[in-house]
Amino acid sequence: KSSNEATNITPKHNMKAFLDELKAENIKKFLYNFTQIPHLAGTEQNFQLAKQIQSQWKEFGLDSVELAHYDVLLSYPNKTHPNYISIINEDGNEIFNTSLFEPPPPGYENVSDIVPPFSAFSPQGMPEGDLVYVNYARTEDFFKLERDMKINCSGKIVIARYGKVFRGNKVKNAQLAGAKGVILYSDPADYFAPGVKSYPDGWNLPGGGVQRGNILNLNGAGDPLTPGYPANEYAYRRGIAEAVGLPSIPVHPIGYYDAQKLLEKMGGSAPPDSSWRGSLKVPYNVGPGFTGNFSTQKVKMHIHSTNEVTRIYNVIGTLRGAVEPDRYVILGGHRDSWVFGGIDPQSGAAVVHEIVRSFGTLKKEGWRPRRTILFASWDAEEFGLLGSTEWAEENSRLLQERGVAYINADSSIEGNYTLRVDCTPLMYSLVHNLTKELKSPDEGFEGKSLYESWTKKSPSPEFSGMPRISKLGSGNDFEVFFQRLGIASGRARYTKNWETNKFSGYPLYHSVYETYELVEKFYDPMFKYHLTVAQVRGGMVFELANSIVLPFDCRDYAVVLRKYADKIYSISMKHPQEMKTYSVSFDSLFSAVKNFTEIASKFSERLQDFDKSNPIVLRMMNDQLMFLERAFIDPLGLPDRPFYRHVIYAPSSHNKYAGESFPGIYDALFDIESKVDPSKAWGEVKRQIYVAAFTVQAAAETLSEVA
C-alpha cells in the first residue's frame, strides 16, 4: 500500500510519479558537471563543489541544506619532493626509477592539481632491501610463503598485486610478516580484460595507470585522531603515535610497466602454483632478491608524504516528513574523488543529485514523504570514510533513536552487465518487490522486469529462482550506520559479469583515467544503467520513507540466521576432537535461532492483522521493525574492533570489503589449529557462541508482543 492516504496528498504523487521524474539526460549532465576538475578531499575545489551542491539542493526544493565541517587527518604527497621507487646498484646509484605521475588522458593535459599516485597515510621513509613477491598479500598468501615455502619477509620490501582484498589488509599482513616496505601494483591479469583496448581507446588500464587509495586499518574508527567522537572545533586529538590504524611502513603504488621492471629480475623461489602468476612476461619468482646477474641490486623506496589535519565538508539536505518527521531515511554518497571521479564517486553523486531533484519536484507540487529523508554528500570517503563517520559520531544519539534506514550511493556502475545489491536481510523483500516493478535496461530483456534479468544473470548460489544479494562488508560510507549503529542499510549498483571478468573491481579504478568520457564512451552511453540504479536507490528511499508499515521482513532474517548458524557450525566441525575435548556446543545458538524464527513468524502474523488506522499501534509495530537491526548491536563491540558492533555481520578481518557472518565466532575459529594455547582459544570460541546466542535471543525478544 502507498502512504497517500496517510499524508492526504493527491494520488498522482506516488512512487510512479517519483520514478517517472528521474531522467537519464539529467544524470549525464550532472556527471559531466561533477567531473571536469579533481575534487580531492580537503582541497578548495572540493569545498566549492560542496557549496554548489548545497545551492542546487536548495533550488531543487529541500527544506534545508547545511554544510557540516570537521577537521580530520588527511594525507598528501609532498609537492616538491615526489614519491618513487628505484632499483639501486651496489654503489647506491639509481639505475631505474618508477614514474612520478600518470600520463594525463587526452583533453586533460592542462588540468592542474592532479594528485600523483600515492598510498594515503603511508609514513615517510627510504627503506632499501631485497624484494619478495607476495601475490595478493592475503592472509593465505603469507601462510603459503611462511609456512609452506619457509620464506621470511622480515626486513624485506614486499611487492603485492592489487585485487581480491582491501589494500589496507595487504599492508597490515605485510607489517605482521616483518616487511619494511610495500609496493602495490596493478597486474594485467586483474586489471586488463582480454579483448578490450586500454584507455583512451577502451576501458582497460594502460601500463602507466596507477590505483591510488588509503592503506589504513581503521576498523570503523573514522578520523584516526578522534576515534568515537566528532572531529569538531573543541575535539581532543590523539598524538600521531596513538592514532588509529596508521601503517608503520612505507607503501607506494605503481603501474604494470614499472612493475615489469621490478618483477623481471626476481630470483629465489619459483611461484608455488599457477594462482601466483599474473599476465606480465615475468617469471613471478617469489625471491627474496633478484636473480644471479642482478643479485647485488636492491630496491629502494622514497616516500615523503605528510599527514595533515584538514577541514572537510559534508552537505546534509533535509526533506521533512509530514507524519513522522522524527524518523529518518538517509540517502548518502561521497563527493570527494582521487582525481576526476568519473565512476567513483561521481556516477553515484550524479544519481543522488537527480533523486534529490525528483523528490524536490514532488515537494514543490505539495507532496511530502511520510518520514523525513536526509540526503548526504560525504567528504573524505577515500581517506577512510571520514565524513560520514564523523557526522554519524556527532549525531549518534539522534540516529540510534530515529534512524530507519541508510541507502548508500557511491559509484552507480562498476560494469554494465547486471544489478548488484548488498543489504540487510530486512530489505530483501523490498528489493525483490521493487525490482519486479522496474523495467530491465539490459539488451535481450526488453519488456522484462529488472528482477528477471538480474535473477537470470546473477542467480543466488543458495536459493534457486532468486537473485544474489550479498552481505554488507565495508569500504564505503554505510559502514558507520550499519556496523556501528545498527541502522538497516543497503546499496545497489550495476556491475560486471563476475563469471567472465575475473579482474578486481573495474580496471581504471582510482586512476587518472576515470573520466566522464570513460563512462559516456564505454560504460553507459545512453545512461540507461545509471537511470536504473537511480530508480533502485530512489525507489528504496521512497518506499522506506513513505510506506505506512515499514517494508522490512523479519522472517528473512530468520532464514539467514539459520544459514549462518549452519555455516559456522560446519566450520567448527572441522575440529571434532577439540569440540569434544573442550565441550564446545552450538546448542544455545541453534536454540536462539529457532526462537527467533518462531517469534518472527508470529510478529509477521500480527503485522498483517493489526489495525493500521490506530497511530499508536502502527508506531509501535514500526518501531519494533526499526529497532530490530539495532538489537543485533553489542555495545562492547567485537574483540579488538570496538566500532564493529554488529554481531551478525562485520567486515572480514582479512578483507575489509567482504562481509563475514557471525564474525566473532568466525575469527575465534580462524587458524585455531595454530594457536599456542588451544584451551584458551577454544574458550574464546565458546564465549563468542555465548555472545551470538544471547544477541539473537535478545533480538528475538524485541519482536515479541510488548505486554
Epitope: S429, R555, K594, S604
Partner: antibody
Framework: EVQLVESGGGLVQPGGSLRLSCAAS????????MSWVRQAPGKGLEWVSA????????YYADSVKGRFTISRDNSKNTLWLQMNSLRAEDTAVYYC??????????????WGQGTLVTVSS | QSVLTQPPSVSAAPGQKVTISCSGS????????VSWYQQLPGTAPKLLIY???KRPSGIPDRFSGSKSGTSATLGITGLQTGDEADYYC???????????FGTGTKVTVL
C-alpha cells in the same frame, strides 16, 4: 482449522511435466515455511523441497535439484511444485506439509492427504 | 538413501514398551531438533514429537522422545493395537541444507 489440500497428480510419461498445487487455509500462510514430501509405493518418506516464509528462499533434495521448482503465492495461500523431466523413480504420493515453527523448516505439524504421481510409459 | 538410520521393525505385546532409535551425525541430529512422525496404514503422516521431546496437543504421554549426541529415541509405553504404524524420525541437516527423514520403523503389536 488448518487445512492443506493437494491436487494436480496423475499419470505422466517419463520426461514429461506436472504441476502440483496445495491450497492452504486456517493459518497465516506467508509466515511459514512449506514443504513437499513424497513417498514411493511401499517405501519411506523422502523430503523433496521447501520454501521459506518471507521472500520464499528455496531448498531442494539432491534427487530433484534442477528438475523441480517450488513456489508460492501468499496472496492466494497456494503452494506449487513444478516437476519437469520426470522419471519413473519420481512415482510417489506427494504430500504438502506446513512447518510448525516459522520461516525455515524445523518440523511438519500439518500434512495434506497427498496426491499420487505416476510416471510410466 | 536416508541419512538417518532406524531399525526396520520392532514388536511387542499390548501394554509393553518399545523404543525406536534414530542414528545420524553431527550435522543433523547432533545440532538440530528431532521430530517423530506416525503414519497409520493408508493415511498421511502425523506429527508425534517435536523439538526432541515435546508432544503436540492431543498426543498421549505414552509417547516420549529424547536425544543424546547424534542419536534420538522414540519411546512408546502401554502399547496398543492402534499404535501399529510406521514411525519416522526427521531433522534438518546443516551440511546439506535439507530436511532428512529416517528409514522408517514398522511397529507391530503382537
Amino acid at each position: 482449522e488448518v487445512q492443506l489440500v493437494e491436487s494436480g497428480g496423475g499419470l505422466v510419461q517419463p520426461g514429461g511435466s506436472l504441476r502440483l498445487s496445495c491450497a492452504a487455509s486456517g493459518f497465516t500462510f506467508s509466515s511459514y515455511a512449506m514443504s513437499w514430501v513424497r513417498q514411493a509405493p511401499g517405501k519411506g518418506l523422502e523430503w523433496v523441497s521447501a520454501i521459506s516464509g518471507g521472500i520464499g528462499s528455496t531448498y531442494y533434495a539432491d534427487s530433484v535439484k534442477g528438475r523441480f521448482t517450488i513456489s508460492r503465492d501468499n496472496s492466494k495461500n497456494t503452494l506449487w511444485l513444478q516437476m519437469n523431466s520426470l522419471r519413473a523413480e519420481d512415482t510417489a504420493v506427494y504430500y504438502c506439509a506446513k512447518d510448525g515453527v516459522g520461516a525455515t523448516p524445523y518440523y511438519f505439524d500439518y500434512w495434506g492427504q497427498g496426491t499420487l504421481v505416476t510416471v510410466s510409459s | 538413501q536416508s541419512v538417518l538410520t532406524q531399525p526396520p521393525s520392532v514388536s511387542a505385546a499390548p501394554g509393553q514398551k518399545v523404543t525406536i532409535s534414530c542414528s545420524g551425525s553431527s550435522s543433523n541430529i547432533g545440532n538440530n531438533y528431532v521430530s517423530w512422525y506416525q503414519q497409520l496404514p493408508g493415511t498421511a503422516p502425523k506429527l508425534l514429537i517435536y523439538d526432541n521431546n515435546k508432544r503436540p496437543s492431543g498426543i498421549p504421554d505414552r509417547f516420549s522422545g529424547s536425544k543424546s549426541g547424534t542419536s534420538a529415541t522414540l519411546g512408546i509405553t502401554g502399547l496398543q493395537t492402534g499404535d501399529e504404524a510406521d514411525y519416522y524420525c526427521g531433522t534438518w541437516d546443516s551440511s546439506l541444507s535439507a530436511y532428512v527423514f529416517g528409514t522408517g520403523t514398522k511397529v507391530t503389536v503382537l
